[in-house]
Interface confidence: medium
Amino acid sequence: CPTSCKCSASRIWCSDPSPGIVAFPRLEPNSVDPENITEIFIANQKRLEIINEDDVEAYVGLRNLTIVDSGLKFVAHKAFLKNSNLQHINFTRNKLTSLSRKHFRHLDLSELILVGNPFTCSCDIMWIKTLQEAKSSPDTQDLYCLNESSKNIPLANLQIPNCGLPSANLAAPNLTVEEGKSITLSCSVAGDPVPNMYWDVGNLVSKHMNETSHTQGSLRITNISSDDSGKQISCVAENLVGEDQDSVNLTVHFAPTITFLESPTSDHHWCIPFTVKGNPKPALQWFYNGAILNESKYICTKIHVTNHTEYHGCLQLDNPTHMNNGDYTLIAKNEYGKDEKQISAHFMGWPGIDDGANPNYPDVIYEDYGTAANDIGDTTNRSNEIPSTDVTDKTGREH
C-alpha cells in the first residue's frame, strides 16, 4: 500500500497530507488484487495533480472514487475507460479548470460531485450545466466558473453563444421489411458546435455499412435476418455539450419455422411442447394421423411464452388414453410461407395388455424362462421418467 495510504481487501484510502502522494495510488504486484477494490478515497493530497490514462484501469471493480481537498488539475480522456462499474465520483474542492464529458459518457453514474473547482467558463463545461438541469433540484450543486473578467459566475447562469445540444433526425422508410431484403436509413444532424454523428446498431446480426459525413449519414442494411426483428437502430449526434439520438425499431417479416417439437411430457396436463418462430404471428394447425385435429377444451393449443417473434407453447391434452396415441403434425403458416414437423406420441398402452399382464402376477416376464432379472437388460430407452413395464415402448412411461 503506498505511503500516506491504508489498504484493505476492498478499499484504499489516502488522507494523510504528510508526506502525501504525488500520483494516483497503485498496489504492489503481490499485495491485494486490484480487481477487488470497490472504493478509493483520497483527501488532502495537494500534490496529486493528474489522473493518467492507465492509473485507474486495474481497478475494474471500482464503484466509488473520491478525491477531495486535493490538487487535481487534469484527468486524461480515457482514464475511466475500463471502470464500467463506477457509480459515484466526488471531485470536490480540487483545481479542475475544465472537464470533458468524454471522460464519463460510457459510464452510468448516479453521482458526479464537482463543487469547489475553479472551472473556466467555456463551452467545454456546458455539458455540466446541461447535466445539472436534467437532474432533479435536490441534487443540484452550487457550481461556478470564472469568466474572462476572472469573475465567479454560477454555472446555472452561464450563457455561451454557439454552444448548445445537438439534434439528430432519422429519415426512415417504413421499417417493416421482409427477411432477406435490404434497406437504407438516412440521418441528418445539426448543432453548434458541429456534432459528430454515428450509428448505434446494438447487436444487429444483419450485414450493415454506413457512410457518414459530419452532418449527414446513411446506413445500409443488407440481407436482413429474422433475428433482427424488434431491434432498435439509433442515429446519434454528439458534441461537447451532449448528445441527441433518434431511433427506429426494425420489424422483419419472415416465414415460420418450427424450431422445436418434442414427444409429450406429463405435468399437470400432457403437453406436446413446441417452439415456433415467425412474423407476422403464424397460424397454427395440428393434424392427428394425417387428419385435421379439431381442438376442444380437452385438446387445445396453449402459448405459454412469447418472445417477440418466437412462441413457446404446448398442444395440451387432458387425460389422453391409448386412443390418442399416434402421429401429431404441427403446421405453422403465415403469408410468407409455412413449416411443418411431426412427432409420434405415446400416452398409454393397451389397457389390460401393456400393463404387465395380470397385475396380481408381477413376474409374468420371467415365467418359463428361468432367467435372472438382470438378463432382461435395459428394456426402456432414452428417458428418465417412470420405468415402464412395456419393454416395447421406448418412452419409458408408465402405462
Epitope: 396415441n325 389390460g352 399382464a357 409374468v364 418359463d368 415402448d393 418412452t395
Partner: antibody
Framework: QVQLQQSGGGVVQPGRSLRLSCAAS????????MHWVRQAPGKGLEWVAV????????YYADSVKGRFTISRDNSRNTLDLQMNSLRAEDTAVYYC??????????WGQGTMVTVSS | LSELTQDPAVSVALGQTVRITCQGD??????ASWYQQKPGQAPVLVIY???NRPSGIPDRFSGSDSGKTASLTITGAQAEDEADYYC???????????FGGGTKLTVL
C-alpha cells in the same frame, strides 16, 4: 411343457363363418394376453387380434374389425377366434400366440383356413 | 397405417456377420421384436426390447436400435440360421401391432 394346441381350420365358402380354437397347457393361462396372427400362403405375418389376460379388453386389425371376435375361457384354458363374413383374402395359416409385455414368446403350430367357392 | 420395411432378401457367407434392418416411423416410439421362421414352422421369438434374448436363443443373435431403424445382427452365421426373419412393433398410434414384410436370409 409350455404348449399351444390349435384346432378348427378347414375350407369354407366366402361369406360363411368358422371358429378357431387354441388350447393352452404348461403355464398359467389366465396370466397372459393372447394374440392371433395369420400368414397368407407365400406371404408375411399379419397381426389379427389380441385379448387381455382377463378377457376385458380386445383389439383388432382394421382388416378384420367387425367380422372377427376374439374370446377366451380361463377356466378351460382356451382361446377362440370366431370368424364371420369370411373373404378370399382371409385365406391363411392362423397362429395363436402367447403375449408378454415384450413380444409373442410361445406360438401354436398353426391351422390352415381356406376361403374358396 | 404406418409400415415396417425390411429388405426382402439378404445372404451371408457361413461364419460371417449379417445385419437385417427394419425401418418405420413407429420405431421412434417402440422397440422391435424379432422372429425367426423356418419353412413349415411357427415363428420363434429371438430378440425383444432393446437387445434381449429369450433363453435358448444363441448369443450370436443381437439387436440394436437407432431412431427409426431397428437391426438384428447375427455374428458368425450358421447354416441353421437360414430362415425368414420378421420384425414386429406397434404402428405409430400404438393401437395396432405391425410386422415387417420379412427378410429371407440365405447362408452360403
Amino acid at each position: 411343457q409350455v404348449q399351444l394346441q390349435q384346432s378348427g381350420g378347414g375350407v369354407v365358402q366366402p361369406g360363411r363363418s368358422l371358429r378357431l380354437s387354441c388350447a393352452a397347457s404348461g403355464f398359467t393361462f389366465s396370466n397372459y394376453a393372447m394374440h392371433w396372427v395369420r400368414q397368407a400362403p407365400g406371404k408375411g405375418l399379419e397381426w389379427v387380434a389380441v385379448i387381455s389376460y382377463d378377457g376385458s379388453n380386445e383389439y383388432y386389425a382394421d382388416s378384420v374389425k367387425g367380422r372377427f371376435t376374439i374370446s377366451r375361457d380361463n377356466s378351460r384354458n382356451t382361446l377362440d377366434l370366431q370368424m364371420n363374413s369370411l373373404r378370399a383374402e382371409d385365406t391363411a395359416v392362423y397362429y395363436c400366440a402367447r403375449g408378454t409385455n415384450y413380444g409373442m414368446d410361445v406360438w401354436g403350430q398353426g391351422t390352415m383356413v381356406t376361403v374358396s367357392s | 397405417l404406418s409400415e415396417l420395411t425390411q429388405d426382402p432378401a439378404v445372404s451371408v457367407a457361413l461364419g460371417q456377420t449379417v445385419r437385417i434392418t427394419c425401418q418405420g416411423d413407429s420405431l421412434r416410439s417402440y422397440y422391435a421384436s424379432w422372429y425367426q421362421q423356418k419353412p413349415g414352422q411357427a415363428p420363434v421369438l429371438v430378440i425383444y426390447g432393446k437387445n434381449n434374448r429369450p433363453s435358448g436363443i444363441p448369443d450370436r443373435f443381437s439387436g440394436s436400435d437407432s431412431g427409426k431403424t431397428a437391426s438384428l445382427t447375427i455374428t458368425g452365421a450358421q447354416a441353421e440360421d437360414e430362415a425368414d426373419y420378421y420384425c414386429q412393433s406397434r404402428d405409430t398410434t400404438g393401437n395396432y401391432l405391425l410386422f415387417g414384410g420379412g427378410t429371407k436370409l440365405t447362408v452360403l
